[in-house]
């Protein structure tokens, strides 16, 4: 807290302008008068404050608007938004998407903040979904913003918004995250071409059941292993081996390095060693010959 | 502790390129300014560029204008000088320097310990 | 730019006060920071807005700036305060940094 001291002779200001950082705190206090900093906020960017002065600027807003902010004043924050809080920012109503960018530029280069997450949370609260042109600029200041994400949250996103999905946005989106994308990818690309849809869904494809990639499989799609290896487990299993091979194509061979992992290890404890003999890939662990396949699953879902 | 560490100095022929590293740590670097500040041998000091806390504003001494550009990396907590068509009188110790605020070089309250930039041929 | 000029050296008896000017026109509508440096290390900042101190900084070190004068003020002067003393300051117009050329401060 600054002590009140009254301003000195002549240090009045009448704008806003680069004199200011040569005033101390408590000049800034006495000095600079907090209706006339709301109304020329968008000058504070372009002046090369000390965060120690910027906290004296906040103090005056927070005086001037105790309740919150309004959005004129937030929009041209600047600088200033990195000395609020979360606490100060939920009393915020963010309702442009101008703001929001406006912000996220200001903390551009830095990990997301508590502060940032608390305005992304409002401004998408505040706008009900998701929709494309915000999320579009929220994975582009932050890729992995996506992924933050709940299922729950993930599931107010309008498929139309899966246009604005790049790959790198999903690396690390877990199944469950994914379970609730990839519908919404089927759909939002359901009137490409064979080619092109594998293109956008590949991505997406860790939340994909058995049968759409059975589907995948009579398309030449030649499936890559690191895309391989990020699908379900028990979307992978009932997959015979001549579907891995028409979905994996040329990228078969990769199998072999694989072994040991899941969903590969996984599905070769499933395949008869016959079959997988047919790859020539040296794969083990099938299922000898002569061995019954009993598919329990299967027996307890008719019972 | 708060800390800025540069490296990257050494003998440089005219005319020739360098490229220095200040890697910082103790403190949220994205959030500051830096300057790199260089000192010829027994010489005064001397301003010669900073960069803003995200990256998006650049300032350069007329001294150095189109020849020397200033970067940093936040992921890699690290500013970068990268110093071409180098003269003799750019011999000197190049420190980096911490303004405490977002963008600006009104004072500089952390400083690294210097290296040592010689073009001689 | 702004020039700032500084007397190139200043001698001072130990337990003495020691006074380093640095002059730069209307230096006192612009802020004045100081900073000490030791043979072979950084520059340590010891003062800025004209007469604040970091933590840290013994409270002999004192500054003061109006007109088109700086002074940097160290009362009781010690052995260790032997050091080169920079004035610095700030053109906003220019946004340029401006350094003093140094002061060797000499206890005797």
């Known amino acids: 807290e600054v002590e009140k001291t009254a301003c000195p002779s002549g240090k009045k200001a009448r704008e806003i302008d680069e004199s200011l950082i040569f005033y101390k705190k408590w000049e800034l206090e006495a000095c600079v008068d907090a209706a006339l900093l709301a109304t020329q906020m968008d000058r504070v960017n372009a002046i090369p404050f000390t965060y120690e002065q910027l906290d004296v600027l906040k103090h005056k807003l927070d005086e001037l608007y105790p309740q919150g902010y309004p959005e004129s004043v937030i929009q041209h924050l600047g600088y200033l938004f990195l000395k609020m809080s979360p606490e100060d920012i939920r009393k915020w109503n963010v309702t442009s998407l101008e703001t929001l960018k406006a912000l996220l530029e200001v903390n551009k280069g830095h990990e997301m903040s508590p502060q940032v997450a608390t305005l992304i949370d409002r401004f998408v609260k505040g706008r009900g979904q998701l929709d494309k042109d915000t999320l579009d600029t929220l994975t582009a200041f932050y890729p992995g913003y996506l992924c933050s994400l709940s299922p729950e949250e993930l599931s107010s996103v309008p498929p139309s918004s899966i246009w604005a999905v790049r790959p790198q946005d999903l690396d690390t989106c877990d199944p469950r995250q994914l379970d609730v994308l990839y519908p919404k990818a089927r759909l939002a690309f359901q009137n490409m071409n064979g080619s092109e849809y594998f293109v956008k869904i590949q991505s997406f494809l860790g939340g994909a059941p058995t049968e759409d990639l059975k589907a995948l499989s009579q398309q030449n799609v030649s499936m890559d292993l690191a895309t391989f290896m990020k699908l379900r487990t028990d979307a992978v299993l009932p997959l015979t081996v001549a579907e891995v091979q028409k979905l994996l194509g040329p990228h078969v061979e990769g199998l072999k390095a694989e072994e040991r992992h899941r969903p590969v290890r996984d599905w070769i404890l499933r395949q008869r060693q016959d079959d997988l003999d047919t790859l020539g890939l040296g794969l083990q662990g099938g299922i000898p010959n002569g061995y019954l396949v009993l598919d329990l699953s299967m027996q307890e879902a008719l019972s | 502790q708060v800390q800025l560490v540069e490296s990257g100095g050494g003998l440089v022929q005219p005319g020739g390129s360098l490229r220095l590293s200040c890697a910082a740590s103790g403190f949220t670097f994205s959030r500051y300014a830096i300057s790199w500040v260089r000192q010829a041998p027994g010489k005064g000091l001397e301003w010669v560029s900073s960069?803003?806390?995200?990256?998006?504003?650049?300032f350069y001494a007329d001294s150095v204008k189109g020849r020397f550009t200033i970067s940093r990396d936040n992921s890699k907590n690290t500013l970068y000088l990268q110093m071409n068509s180098l003269r003799a009188e750019d011999t000197a110790v190049y420190y980096c320097a911490r303004y405490p605020g977002p963008t600006g070089h009104v004072f500089f309250d952390i400083w690294g310990q210097g290296t040592l930039v010689t073009v001689s041929s | 730019d702004i020039e700032l000029t500084q007397p190139p050296s200043v001698s001072v008896a130990p337990g003495q006060t020691a006074r380093i000017s640095c002059s730069g026109d209307n230096i006192g509508s612009k802020v004045a920071t100081w900073y000490q440096q030791k043979p072979g290390q950084a520059p340590v900042l010891v003062i800025y807005y004209d007469n604040d101190r970091p933590s840290g900084i013994p409270e002999r070190f004192s500054g003061s700036n109006s007109g088109n004068t700086a002074t940097l003020t160290i009362s009781g002067t010690q052995a260790e305060d032997e050091a080169d003393y920079y004035c610095?300051?700030?053109?906003?117009?220019?946004?340029?940094?401006?350094f003093g050329g140094g002061t060797k401060l000499t206890v005797l």
């Open positions: 610095q300051s700030y053109d906003g117009q220019m946004s340029t940094s401006v």
């Open positions: 960069i803003s806390g995200g990256g998006s504003k650049t």
